[in-house]
Interface confidence: low
Amino acid sequence: RGVFRRDAHKSEVAHRFKDLGEENFKALVLIAFAQYLQQCPFEDHVKLVNEVTEFAKTCVADESAENCDKSLHTLFGDKLCTVATLRETYGEMADCCAKQEPERNECFLQHKDDNPNLPRLVRPEVDVMCTAFHDNEETFLKKYLYEIARRHPYFYAPELLFFAKRYKAAFTECCQAADKAACLLPKLDELRDEGKASSAKQRLKCASLQKFGERAFKAWAVARLSQRFPKAEFAEVSKLVTDLTKVHTECCHGDLLECADDRADLAKYICENQDSISSKLKECCEKPLLEKSHCIAEVENDEMPADLPSLAADFVESKDVCKNYAEAKDVFLGMFLYEYARRHPDYSVVLLLRLAKTYETTLEKCCAAADPHECYAKVFDEFKPLVEEPQNLIKQNCELFEQLGEYKFQNALLVRYTKKVPQVSTPTLVEVSRNLGKVGSKCCKHPEAKRMPCAEDYLSVVLNQLCVLHEKTPVSDRVTKCCTESLVNRRPCFSALEVDETYVPKEFNAETFTFHADICTLSEKERQIKKQTALVELVKHKPKATKEQLKAVMDDFAAFVEKCCKADDKETCFAEEGKKLVAASQAALGL
């Protein structure tokens, strides 16, 4: 039942154009180009996309026409390499154009920048946006795709089409509402937050495939799909995993047309076979394509079948364990992971993968021993501490979150992580710690049975952000070690890091702690970021500062900002009171 075995097509570009339709074809080519050439102006990309689209239409009309038999990588790569300013804008990325496929595409992929030097997206006034939307809806929506894709070069392309559809719906509805802003702004905020989360989740999938290989991604998919579809047979889950792996490999590899096409096929297959997959799919399968695929990806876990037998019989007590393992190691381990995961929707995927790794290690050792059964008989005893560690950590941190609230919980994490890895840049520490802190409001509200999958799998996504940002400019051996040694042990590795005793404190620079009246006009979120940036810098100057010392300084700082923002002459207040604050802080911290 291989969904993706297709007849060979004379023209790949014509085949994808016909499968996807013109609108999706153009949108996906725009996303692909913007994710590769992140600095190019919008107009240049639109021109390239139009040229590719016109060419695709000639191939639809006649698949034997000149160049229609070329691969998509060749066609798109040739098009990207026509950009006149490639060397000036992208430097050594221009050298990719001297290579042949498939090396050229690999070269473009390696130059994708997770933190491109682009201005922050500033949201215009609602009336300005509505006018732009009405004046030229098509350009307005293309601009959205372009701006998101260039800032998130691994965004899951078919999902970005779904976001664009919701973006369009928001403007269509709200630009004719009585109170446009009240209607539109909450919708845009929701799309922004969901978009960031979607981007980060996909970035982890791509990192998993690119840094740890297909086997690692498939193991993740077996565990997650087994939790989600516990009634499905192992063969069914394996088939879904194979197809899902192909979809994500394509999207992470820049093959966005194939990825979107194959994702649609997978959604179709799931809906046609929902009886043997899950009872929760009915509503999803009644939706249009983009909504359907999104809905399936987010669908709740099905109920566990009643009376599942004990795992011990097949995986510990059976005399055939080593025989079964030797015959087909990955299949046997896949069955173990499937059986364990479908019984444990209360575990995080990374925990399930740790258990499977422990089981694999034990079998590797024991199946070579004199008495294998005696050796692996107590392997399940090994699991208890692995399970308890995240349970305890989540319990402690949720208690701390409930005690402090989100902002102060983020601050506690900022201090904790700055002390662990003080070499990491301040903006990265602030961004990552703020996101780590969001685990509280996201997961601590859940009952015990849902806390661990929510929290630990979310933390894996956030720590991957740290890993990809750090990989661009590596500054800490400890971060590199935690990021590269084991995908599933990243979180325990970071949790285990103590204060970095080798760190030489940063020289004190009063400029870092000089603030101006512009802070008063910032939003609450931006003001928090300013204060948290100062907190990180304080810890970098004085890594041995106690919680009490840091709290005292931060309280003084908050009072100083509040006082000066109420003053008549704000700038003078910031200048004079700021000097006093810096002196008092230096004294308090013994700087």
Epitope: T362, K365, C375, K378, V379, E382, P385, N489, C493, S495
Partner: nanobody, 126 residues
């Protein structure tokens, strides 16, 4: 290769205390999962307490929880077992075991520990 050498055993009255030490050489003790096991005459070797490699998460057998404390001093490359409120049933030879490769969690399965000390005898009797 890891060498382990236990010390601190002896005769003690019920309710008394002892502190066992295990000096490691050949590898840093914080890079290994380390544990204490014990074997009473005519009985199987059993897990007493363990501590993960690279992370100070500790585990105890139910029979010793609240009475025994495992710890390590990385600067001295030494593992300790503080035993309070000793009972006659704690009488056994106590072994220190190490499992390198920095496992984050210690194992309670003796077979998974490749390195063992010679053992030190603890006798609890009046």
């Amino acid at each position: 290769e890891v060498q382990l050498l236990e010390s601190g055993g002896g005769l003690v009255q019920p309710g008394g205390s002892l502190r066992l030490s295990c000096a490691a050489s050949g590898r840093y003790i914080d890079e290994t999962a380390v544990a204490w096991f014990r074997q009473a005459p005519g009985k199987e070797r059993e897990f007493v307490a363990g501590i993960g490699g690279g992370v100070d998460i500790t585990y105890y057998a139910d029979s010793v929880k609240g009475r025994f404390t495992i710890s390590r001093d990385n600067s001295k490359n030494t593992l300790y077992l503080q035993m309070n409120s000793l009972r006659p049933e704690d009488t056994a030879v106590y072994y220190c075991a190490a499992r390198p490769g920095k496992p984050l969690i210690t194992s309670k399965v003796a077979d998974l520990y490749p390195y063992w000390g010679q053992g030190t005898l603890v006798t609890v009797s009046s």
